[in-house]
Interface confidence: low
């Protein structure tokens, strides 16, 4: 049912850790622009896009990787308390803009142990293509869209 057909996925991660969120999109939208945005009182603010210049400013902490095959991956690293909030995967596809998946992120106090990754479940939505529901291994560092 898309963004509003179900409750947002809730992720909890400590300060300093990272999260990995995966969203499905339809195979017809493989060339469409994908966006990760944050729901703020003033709007759904795009944070990172598949169409942006990869020479991103130093210090960027959100990275979007279009893995192809109907799978989009978003990584938020070095999480801070102010990162708590609601986010969404969006695609500007053949059917027009679609919010594929929504995530509610809660930030916990920092952990003493080493940095951890919290992995979001695959986003099931009405616009998924079964052929794109594979769950590939996390890409290596050089496959991510990190400048």
């Amino acid at each position: 049912q898309g963004i509003v057909g179900s409750l947002p996925e809730v992720l909890q991660a400590p300060v300093g850790s990272s999260i990995l969120v995966q969203c499905h999109y339809r195979l017809q939208d493989v060339k469409a622009q994908k966006v990760w945005c944050r729901f703020l009182p003033e709007g759904c603010q795009p944070l990172v896009s598949s169409a942006v210049d990869r020479r991103a400013p130093a210090g960027r902490r959100t990275f979007l990787t279009d893995l192809g095959g109907g799978l989009l991956q978003v990584e938020m690293v070095t999480l801070q308390e102010e990162d708590a909030g609601e986010y969404g995967c969006m695609v500007d596809g053949a059917r027009g803009p679609q919010i594929l998946h929504r995530v509610s992120l809660n930030i916990l106090p920092p952990e003493e142990e080493e940095e951890t990754h919290k992995i979001g479940s695959l986003a099931e939505n009405a616009f998924s293509d079964p052929a794109g529901s594979a769950n590939p291994l996390e890409p290596s560092q050089d496959e991510k869209s990190i400048p």
């Epitope: 603010q45 500007d92 059917r95 027009g96 803009p97 679609q98």
Partner: nanobody
Framework: QVQLVESGGGLVQPGGSLRLSCAAS??????????VNWFRQPPGKQHEVVAS???????NYADSVKGRFTISRDNVKNAVYLQMNSLKPEDTALYYC???????????WGPGTQVTVSS
């Protein structure tokens, strides 16, 4: 600068109906180019999406309003509506519309309209 304006809110008894409207104050703005969400923010709670319509007319609804709320768009009047039936006290909230165009990231909000469901 595009300004969105909501209207149609008010006080209604449980089981009653209201129709909210969202219009743009700027000529040249077309809702048909945007993904439009109706949000609501209950007193003391976070905002939530209750209904969405994309440029091609595909609609989505929150589980809590399915079968009671209907989102629609009138391209001639250039407005988006939220028809709310069988209203419940828990539907009491500030309702506001949000239009987002992913290409370019343009997005606009209205100030909201208050809906109060009480006997």
């Amino acid at each position: 600068q595009v300004q969105l304006v909501e209207s149609g809110g008010g006080l209604v008894q449980p089981g009653g109906s209201l129709r909210l409207s969202c219009a743009a104050s700027t000529s040249g703005f077309s809702f048909s180019d945007y993904y439009v969400n109706w949000f609501r923010q209950p007193p003391g709670k976070q905002h939530e999406v209750v209904a969405s319509i994309n440029p091609n007319g595909f609609t989505n609804y929150a589980d809590s309003v399915k079968g009671r709320f209907t989102i629609s768009r009138d391209n001639v009047k250039n407005a988006v509506y939220l028809q709310m039936n069988s209203l419940k006290p828990e539907d009491t909230a500030l309702y506001y519309c949000h239009a987002v165009r992913i290409s370019g990231g343009a997005n606009y909000w209205g100030p909201g309209t208050q809906v109060t469901v009480s006997s």
